[in-house]
Interface confidence: low
């Protein structure tokens, strides 16, 4: 028999079936050109000394074989004696050491057995009722297919699955979706209704993220507030990267997890926009306000869990930057202005009530006045900061108030509201003898001392009632005691104490009379 023809004789070996699980498998035969055909198969087991024979039985009942030696692929023409227009049954017999191993047979019409293409181009992936749905355009002239998929995770080997028959211009497949690990999928096709026809090659990998994106494990640090009233938020620890299956380790689209930063500015609630979302790579500058920061992970299926941090307000205060003048019409604040057309947000809140919502006012965009100052005024009737207590005031500025990341802190300071002059008057002034010519004067701390930076100093005034001579003694704001020296015995004195702020003289306390007794010697 010629090697190019199917030999209509008995094969040159005895048919002693080994019954082994190994041997030839996955036989596929198809047309490769108008008159050319190909059959190929796999062989499992030791290959030394193995000879392969492609067996063929025609519909007429006659049978023949091709001897391929050690090769597991054979090409032949429509002139090789095998009917290509009628149904034929083909199988492989592999002969070695006087034993024969057989493949499962395939029954087909060779002329109609076209090598199908795998899904090509864009494979769309979506989630449907907790499962994975893949969809693609059917390759040209190949409508009517059986489709299989295989999938693996980073830690598992390939598992095979069936997509069922397809008969449309678009094909689709439902596959299992893993909750917490990435998967690699591949698809293959073969002609519908011809079990013997061959499978296409596997498609390019389709990389699918887990249903739940991973919890973003990141850490932040916040730099000190700069002179411009802004501080940089920096990422100390990058999110952990998802473990990927082998075929998804290059630049595989579809499996990426994106991380976004969601900023929520808690201070100044009266501004236009309190929340902003930006990519994690784009670390923003923040004002000295308090913020909540969330890192949100998401993949092609949507958002996953997030991790939230609280960034406390920068409590550094500048006691001198704010000037407050109280007049009959109301109160005006002055502070060093920023650029032209700047919007300011003035926020205040009683000290000790930090949990409650702060009062907040947004100015219209304003230019600096001739002295380079910005101002904010309110009437007495408004009741703003009218109570005699300590208020924490923060002023923020922005040329673009709708852009959350462009706010900066102008100043943060404290102010004593209401009639600070009267409210700050020291009480419980007491005088104790100290020596023959000195006394110790003590008083209870002024209410102003509860307000950091507000109390500039105490002033103690001593008046000699005989001569009407007055002396004044400045005392540090942290002290509540002073010693008055060089006093004369037997003379009546009055002492008073007042508490002063940077912009306001306090009211004197009630006069306290005292005298040093004259010592009588024996």
């Amino acid at each position: 028999c010629r090697t190019s023809e199917c030999c209509f004789q008995d094969p040159p070996y005895s048919d002693a079936d080994s019954g082994s699980a190994s041997g030839p498998r996955d036989l596929s035969c198809y047309r490769i050109s108008s008159a050319g055909y190909e059959c190929s198969w796999q062989y499992e087991g030791p290959t030394a000394g193995v000879s392969h024979f492609l067996r063929c039985c025609l519909s007429s009942g006659r049978c023949c074989y091709f001897a391929t030696g050690s090769a597991t692929r054979l090409q032949f023409s429509d002139q090789a004696g095998v009917s290509v227009l009628h149904t034929v049954t083909l199988w492989v017999e592999s002969w070695a050491r006087n034993r024969t191993e057989k493949s499962p047979e395939v029954t087909l019409q060779l002329y109609k057995s076209v090598k199908y293409k795998p899904p090509l181009g864009d494979i769309k992936v979506s989630k449907l009722a907790g499962q994975l749905r893949m969809e693609w355009e059917t390759p040209d002239n190949q409508v009517g297919a059986e489709v299989q998929f295989r999938h693996r995770t980073p830690s598992s080997s390939w598992k095979l699955g069936d997509c069922g028959p397809q008969d449309d211009d678009t094909e689709s497949c439902l596959c299992p979706l893993e909750m917490n690990v990435a998967q690699e999928f591949q698809l293959r096709r073969r002609r519908l209704g011809s079990q013997g026809s061959s499978w296409s090659k596997w498609s390019s990998p389709v990389c699918v993220p887990p249903e739940n994106p991973p919890q973003p494990q990141v850490r932040f640090s916040v730099e000190q507030l700069g002179r411009d009233g802004r501080r940089r938020l920096t990422l100390k620890e990058q999110p952990t990267q998802l473990e990927l299956p082998e075929g998804c380790q290059g630049p595989a689209p579809g499996v990426e997890v994106t991380y976004q930063l969601q900023l929520h500015m808690l201070s100044c609630p009266c501004k236009a926009k309190a929340t902003r979302t930006l990519p994690l790579e784009k670390m923003p500058y923040l004002s000295g306000a308090a913020y909540n920061v969330a890192v949100i992970s998401s993949n092609r299926f949507g958002p996953g869990p997030n991790q939230t941090w609280h960034i406390p307000a920068d409590t550094h205060t500048e006691p001198v930057a704010l000037n407050i003048s109280v007049g009959t019409n109301g109160t005006t604040m002055y502070w060093p202005a920023r650029a032209q057309s700047t919007t300011y947000c003035i926020e205040w809140q009683p000290v000790g009530q930090e949990g409650s919502l702060a009062t907040c006012n947004l100015t219209a965009p304003q230019d600096p006045d001739p002295a380079g100052m910005a101002t904010y005024s309110w009437s007495r009737e408004s009741g703003a900061m009218g109570q005699e207590k300590c208020y924490h005031i923060t002023i923020f500025a922005s040329a673009h108030p709708k852009k959350l990341t462009l706010w900066s802190t102008v100043l943060s300071t404290y102010h004593f509201g209401g009639n600070a002059s009267a409210a700050g008057t020291p009480h419980h002034v007491s005088v104790k003898n100290h020596s023959l010519d000195s006394v110790s004067v003590d008083w209870a701390p002024s209410l102003l001392s509860t307000c950091p930076g507000v109390l500039k100093e105490y002033v103690v005034r001593c008046r000699d009632e005989d001569s009407n001579q007055v002396s004044e003694h400045p005392v540090q704001p942290t002290e509540t005691q002073v010693t008055l020296s060089d006093l004369r015995a037997g003379v009546a004195y009055t002492v008073q104490v007042r508490a002063d702020t940077a912009w306001l003289r306090g009211a004197w306390s009630q006069p306290q009379r005292f005298s040093i007794k004259v010592q009588v010697s024996d």
Epitope: R133, H151, D162, P176, E178
Partner: nanobody, 121 residues
């Protein structure tokens, strides 16, 4: 010929537990999905849970965190562990096998006769 036989149904008080079993015979393919459905009188058949050949599981929202589906491949058996049962879980529970997955999910070609579960308050 594929055959599915369910067992383990019965009557139980609310808050109690039951374990249903479904034994399959005659399956030639290893790649199949096994699922539980339920049907109460006058109500449409409802999907309860499914388990794929690779072990992936899916649950109806109404039973999530209460029911657990599992399988024993060697025995070709699927189980449904039902905890914290409620009166609204009362139904006939049927086991099904899908050997093909079409565009609309597993096609359940084979069905068991069903087992009655009654939960009283």
């Amino acid at each position: 010929q594929v055959q599915l036989v369910e067992s383990g149904g019965g009557a139980v008080q609310a808050g109690g537990s039951l374990r249903l079993s479904c034994a399959a015979s005659g399956l030639t393919s290893r790649h199949y999905v096994m699922a539980w459905f339920r049907q109460a009188p006058g109500i449409e058949r409802e999907f309860v849970a499914s388990i794929w050949w690779g072990g992936s599981t899916y649950y109806a929202d109404s039973v999530k965190d209460r029911f657990t589906i599992s399988r024993d491949n060697a025995e070709n058996t699927v189980y449904l562990q039902m905890n914290s049962l409620k009166p609204e879980d009362t139904a006939v529970y049927r086991c099904a096998v899908g050997t093909k997955i079409g565009t609309m999910g597993p096609r359940y070609d084979y069905w068991g006769q069903g087992t009655q579960v009654t939960v009283s308050s």
